[in-house]
């Protein structure tokens, strides 16, 4: 947020940039939380724009019985590993095809025991306030589907008739990690010393980090003809004086007609 300064007063302005603002030779360059000619004003809204998507990662282990382990499979750059990765990925894409949040799989390690496949199942969903529930549901479906396929696709008489066969007892879910996104916490952090006065309100499922000085929200402070200004003690209305009136009161809702006051003073003189 920048405010340009023209004229002789600029040199004086340079030394007066407030709240960590820096002079660039023409204007005060204000940190995120401030604006104004001297960076003296606190912004009324902070962009905490949620990520477009939220991700989850499930650490799984399955045992593939239709492939015999060979030393080449330890080397991730070998042709054998690459071929196994392609077939395993294709198989998992089929297994999880009905899950809209499914992105893919990432093999982390192959080890002996037929072939024990340590891998991550990657999930992603569009950000909504309900993203945790969406991803929790998706992880449950992943568990169901992998349990089902590793129970059904098994070797019969040492032969597999599917793309891959599995050991029913070799399927384990080690860990589930969901990217954490907490708009309330982000809002508080970014508002720094004004954190007590900034809140998150939702519009079209998008979170907005706002102070009561931001108009159009349920927490918005109505200063009438005055101006809402944030201070360390909270939002305050700075009341204006017009040609005809003085305004006062907590929300500048009390107007005093100047002519009455002047008339009153004039009467006293």
């Amino acid at each position: 947020r920048t405010t340009t300064c023209f004229g002789d007063g600029c040199q004086n302005t340079a030394s007066r940039c407030k709240n960590g603002g820096t002079w660039d030779g023409l204007k005060c360059q204000c940190p995120n939380l401030y604006y104004g000619e001297l960076c003296e004003e606190v912004v009324s809204s902070i962009d905490i724009g949620p990520p477009e998507t939220i991700s989850a990662q499930m650490e799984l282990t399955v045992t593939v019985t239709s492939v015999k382990f060979t030393e080449e499979l330890k080397n991730h750059s070998s042709q054998e590993f690459q071929e196994f990765k392609q077939t395993f990925t294709e198989q998992m894409n089929i297994v999880y095809s009905g899950i809209p949040e499914y992105v893919g799989v990432n093999i982390t390690k192959l080890r002996l025991g037929s072939v024990v496949v340590e891998h991550d199942v990657l999930l992603r969903t569009k950000y909504t306030p309900e993203y945790k529930t969406v991803l929790d549901n998706a992880t449950e479906v992943v568990k169901e589907k992998i349990t089902k396929v590793t129970t059904q696709q098994i070797m019969i008489n040492d032969i597999c008739s599917d793309m891959m066969c599995f050991n029913t007892t070799g399927t384990q879910v080690q860990n589930i990690t969901v990217t954490q996104y907490d708009p309330e916490e982000d809002c508080r952090k970014m508002a720094k010393e004004y954190g007590d006065y900034f809140v998150v309100e939702y519009r079209d499922q998008k979170p907005y980090c706002i102070s009561p000085c931001e108009p159009g929200f349920s927490v918005s402070k109505n200063c009438n003809l005055g101006k809402c200004q944030m201070s360390l003690s909270g939002p305050q209305c700075l009341c204006v004086t017009t040609e005809t009136h003085w305004y006062s009161g907590e929300t500048c809702n009390q107007g005093t007609q100047k002519s009455l006051v002047y008339g009153h003073h004039h009467h006293h003189h």
């Epitope: 019985t65 239709s66 492939v67 015999k68 060979t70 080449e72 042709q79 054998e80 071929e83 196994f84 392609q86 077939t87 294709e90 070797m155 040492d158 032969i159 597999c160 008739s161 599917d162 793309m163 891959m164 066969c165």
Partner: nanobody
């Protein structure tokens, strides 16, 4: 680049024999798995037989005792000796390969394929 080229197909009478060959280039035939598949008109591709790098073999029930799969690592070749042929053996026969030691007769597990050779059993 892996290339598999089949040969040896043709017309044969019921009860007769044929030997199919598959020449593999760019594929280390001493490794992984090589297999024969077949596809009859209007039917799905099915596994006939496969052989692993250590010589382990497996056959479909319908060809057991009649067909023999073998590989010659020195010549980088795969063979299928077919005896006592029947009308139901009529199909296009494909050679397939994988660098992995596979124990599956599912076509989706094999990334490398030949163009196929036609075998017709008819009197």
């Amino acid at each position: 680049e892996v290339q598999l080229v089949e040969s040896g197909g043709g017309l044969v009478q019921p009860g007769g024999s044929l030997r199919l060959s598959c020449a593999a280039s760019g594929f280390p035939s001493s490794r992984g798995t090589m297999a024969w598949f077949r596809q009859a008109p209007g039917k799905e591709r099915e596994g006939v037989a496969f052989i692993n790098s250590d010589g382990r073999t497996s056959y479909a029930e319908s060809v057991k005792g009649r067909f023999t799969i073998s590989r010659d690592n020195a010549k980088n070749s795969l063979y299928l000796q077919m005896n006592s042929l029947r009308a139901e053996d009529t199909a296009v026969y494909y050679c397939a390969a994988s660098l992995l030691y596979l124990m599956t007769v599912n076509a989706a597990a094999y990334p490398y394929w030949g163009q196929g050779t036609m075998v017709t059993v008819s009197s």
